[in-house]
Interface confidence: low
């Protein structure tokens, strides 16, 4: 009304999007009767009647608020449900009696933005760019009003800085009336920023106060020139022949340069390029002593064509050469002596051991094994082991067979075998000697011979048990250039029902099996009674 004092500031009502705003008409009784009130919304200085109160009863006016308004608090309060950003305006109530007075309410609407989404520039940033490059983009969706964005690097806020840091923010209004904020951080980065953590923070207000949301932290691919290349060898420590060794080039630039690995030819002193795998790694598998030498890496920047050379690295593949034993195939008479000498080369100090092959017993620690007053039992295998004590697993061995001249000797002289008539027996006989003997049997049957080692032979015989065979027994004879020797197998009848399972009269490596004549093509292990004390 003209001439009246300036209107007081409207009452502030703050509410979140989607909730209900309670608009309380603040007219005093002297200013008007609350049972007769008109409610208006004011938008761009234009008043629109939205609700009438008559005799305490409310009635919505047709329009955008028709479905969302209701009276509360005995008519003093107008409730507006499902508040939207478009509802941010002034509402006023006007009392009609005793005279027209109005009360204004400023409705403020808030909506927290969604979690900020940060996207790093996937192409990366070169350190030598002339002006700030796009580092990352931060998007905060569906907030109201527009949130404020702050960028952080390593936990510290970034400020606009001429030619160094530029923050470019823009917003769009969604159909819902909510704002989507997009902020682009542009910066000039340095090499040290390769590990820097960037994130953005959205600051926004709600009726409850000020709030903020942080994005995840991101790192940006930073491209910077290589200043140094070097070689790395895996595994670290002492290498040995047979290991899988990987030699790789490393560089302090990003992206790394194109690598090539060269080995110095020890004869020509020239670097010869080695063939690397698809990852630029030189894999030596298995590593050999020839792989030892001086390696270096060349890094070629394909953009600038600048080439950098690493410090050379000396690679030592430790080895033990083939072990040589002399004499290589010793032959001696009984009663004589023998000195076995073991030799090998290595990149490290060697330790030698002599072992008896058959038993694994250590006979000597050192390269020379002396055997005196040789008996025939001394014949057989001796193994020299050349090892590098400082490198576990680095060893080579050589087996030498000592042959003692002599007539054959048998694994057993005589044996009793329990049999049943008409069974097929599987008999075996073993003999040793030098020269290696051959074995013959005194009965007809199917015999086969196997060389067990240079001095030892095993013969097996399949034979049908007949009355004649029970009478004569079975003899095996071993012979060589120096003599002959015989083993006798006595066959004794037994009733199968009296046999005890798993009893065994076999001595040495001899075995006997029996099966019914009706199954002459198959054999099964014979069950034998215990051998008598006396061997007869």
């Amino acid at each position: 009304v003209p001439g009246e004092a300036e209107q007081p500031a409207p009452e502030l009502v703050e509410v979140e999007v989607g909730s209900t705003a309670l608009l309380k008409c603040g007219l005093s009784q002297s200013q008007g009767n609350l049972s007769h009130v008109d409610w208006f919304s004011v938008h761009k200085e234009k008043r629109t009647l939205i609700f009438r109160v008559r005799q305490g009863q409310g009635q919505s006016e047709p329009g955008e608020y028709e479905q969302r308004l209701s009276l509360q608090d005995r008519g003093a309060t107008l409730a507006l449900t499902q508040v939207t950003p478009q509802d941010e305006r002034i509402f006023l109530c006007q009392g009609k009696r005793p005279r027209s007075q109005e009360y204004r309410i400023q409705l403020r609407v808030y909506k927290a933005p969604e979690e900020p989404n940060i996207q790093v520039n996937p192409l990366g940033i070169p350190v030598n760019s002339k002006e700030p490059e796009e580092v990352a983009t931060c998007v905060g969706r569906n907030g109201y009003p527009i949130p404020q964005v702050i960028w952080y690097k390593n936990g510290r806020p970034l400020k606009e800085e001429k030619n160094r840091v530029h923050i470019q923010s823009s917003q769009t209004v969604e159909s819902s009336g909510l704002y989507t904020l997009q902020s682009i951080l542009k910066a000039q980065l340095v090499k040290e920023d390769k590990d820097a953590q960037f994130y953005c923070e959205l600051n926004y207000r709600l009726p409850s106060g000020n709030h903020m949301k942080e994005s995840r932290e991101v790192t940006v691919p930073v491209f910077y020139p290589t200043e140094k290349v070097w070689l790395e060898v895996e595994p670290v420590g002492m290498l040995k022949e047979g290991d899988r060794v990987e030699i790789r080039c490393l560089a302090d630039g990003n992206p790394p340069p194109h690598f090539s690995i060269s080995k110095q030819n020890p004869s020509t002193r020239e670097a010869e390029e080695e063939t690397t795998n698809d990852n630029g790694v030189l894999v030596l598998e298995p590593a050999r002593k020839e792989h030892s030498g001086r390696y270096e890496c060349q890094g070629l920047d394909l953009d600038t064509m600048i080439s950098l050379l690493s410090e050379p690295q000396e690679l030592l593949v430790n080895y033990v050469s083939d072990v040589r034993v002399s004499p290589a195939a010793p032959e001696r008479q009984e009663g004589s002596s023998l000195t076995l000498t073991c030799e090998a080369e290595s990149s490290q100090d060697l330790e030698f051991q002599w072992l008896r092959e058959e038993t694994g017993q250590v006979l000597e620690r050192g390269p020379v094994l002396q055997l005196h007053d040789l008996k025939r039992e001394a014949g057989g295998g001796y193994r020299c082991v050349a090892s590098v004590p400082s490198i576990p697993g680095l060893n080579r061995t050589q087996l030498v067979n000592v042959a003692i001249f002599g007539p054959p000797w048998m694994a057993f002289k005589e044996r009793k075998v329990w049999v049943k008539e008409n069974m097929v027996l599987n008999l075996s006989c073993e003999a040793s000697g030098h020269p290696r003997p051959t074995i013959s049997w005194n009965v007809n049957g199917t015999a086969s011979e196997q060389d067990q080692d240079p001095q030892r032979v095993l013969s097996t015989l399949n034979v049908l048990v007949t009355p004649e065979l029970l009478e004569t027994g079975v003899e095996c004879t071993a012979s060589n250039d120096l003599g002959k020797n015989t083993s006798i197998l006595f066959l004794e009848l037994v009733n199968l029902t009296t046999l005890t399972p798993d009893s065994n009269t076999t001595t040495g490596l001899s075995t006997s099996t029996a099966s019914p004549h009706t199954r002459a093509n198959s054999t099964s292990t014979e069950r034998k009674l215990p051998e008598p004390e006396s061997r007869g």
């Epitope: 030819n265 004869s267 020509t268 020239e270 010869e272 050999r288």
Partner: antibody, heavy 121, light 107 residues
Framework: EVQLLQSGGGLVQPGGSLRLSCAAS????????MSWVRQAPGKGLEWVSA????????YYTDSVKGRFTISRDNSKNTLYLQMNSLRAEDTAVYYC??????????????WGQGTLVTVSS | ILTQDPAVSVALGQTVRITCQGD??????ASWYQQKPGQAPVLVIY???NRPSGIPDRFSGSSSGTTASLTITGAQAEDEADYYC????????????FGGGTKLTVL
């Protein structure tokens, strides 16, 4: 395209001398070791001599040591074999050969056309 | 120092293996060369089992102990030639050595 063009062969009397040349093109000559390989008529290949890319190291098979000298002129991209005190058994086709990129572990990937040396009175 | 069979024959389209023996092959792979009459040798296999460009994939190499092998799978008439193995000397010097060569006849 790699090319090795040989010259200098011919007939020479026992005790005489001859110099073989091998002009290289199509690759960085000074980066590669080079060798001479010979083949007597109807016989197999026999490695004779090698020289490092810089020319600083030379190697010979026993039968030619002290009589043959391998050399190279990297400014002219040319390999040489100076043969003195020639013998009848030196009669052969002589080939120059370029070592593989990987070095002589991988053998010789390019060969000259060969030049015949005949030692006869 | 490198030993090869003097001659080997193979029926057209069949597989043939040419072997090379020598102490140096424990430490080094053999290179293999093909030589046709009146021509310079041609490298066909180098290293573990690598073919230079232009060499058909019917050629392959392998090695076990002191023996190296060149295998031609599905031999063609044009494969008839002399084949030489080649290696560094086993003495650890920079010397090289060739095998005596194997004459391959394709029947």
């Amino acid at each position: 395209e790699v090319q090795l063009l040989q010259s200098g062969g011919g007939l020479v009397q026992p005790g005489g001398s001859l110099r073989l040349s091998c002009a290289a093109s199509g690759f960085t000559f000074s980066s590669y070791a080079m060798s001479w390989v010979r083949q007597a008529p109807g016989k197999g290949l026999e490695w004779v001599s090698a020289i490092s890319g810089s020319g600083g190291s030379t190697y010979y098979t026993d039968s030619v040591k002290g009589r043959f000298t391998i050399s190279r002129d990297n400014s002219k991209n040319t390999l040489y074999l100076q043969m003195n005190s020639l013998r009848a058994e030196d009669t052969a086709v002589y080939y120059c050969a370029k070592s593989h990129d990987y070095g002589d572990y991988a053998g010789f990937d390019y060969w000259g056309q060969g030049t015949l040396v005949t030692v006869s009175s | 120092i490198l030993t090869q069979d003097p001659a080997v024959s193979v029926a057209l389209g069949q597989t043939v293996r040419i072997t090379c023996q020598g102490d140096s092959l424990k430490s080094y792979y053999a290179s293999w060369y093909q030589q046709k009459p009146g021509q310079a040798p041609v490298l066909v296999i180098y290293g573990k089992n690598n073919r230079p460009s232009g060499i058909p994939d019917r050629f392959s190499g392998s090695s076990s102990g002191t023996t190296a092998s060149l295998t031609i799978t599905g031999a063609q008439a044009e494969d008839e030639a002399d084949y030489y193995c080649h290696s560094r000397d086993s003495s650890g010097t920079h010397l090289r050595v060739f095998g005596g060569g194997t004459k391959l006849t394709v029947l």
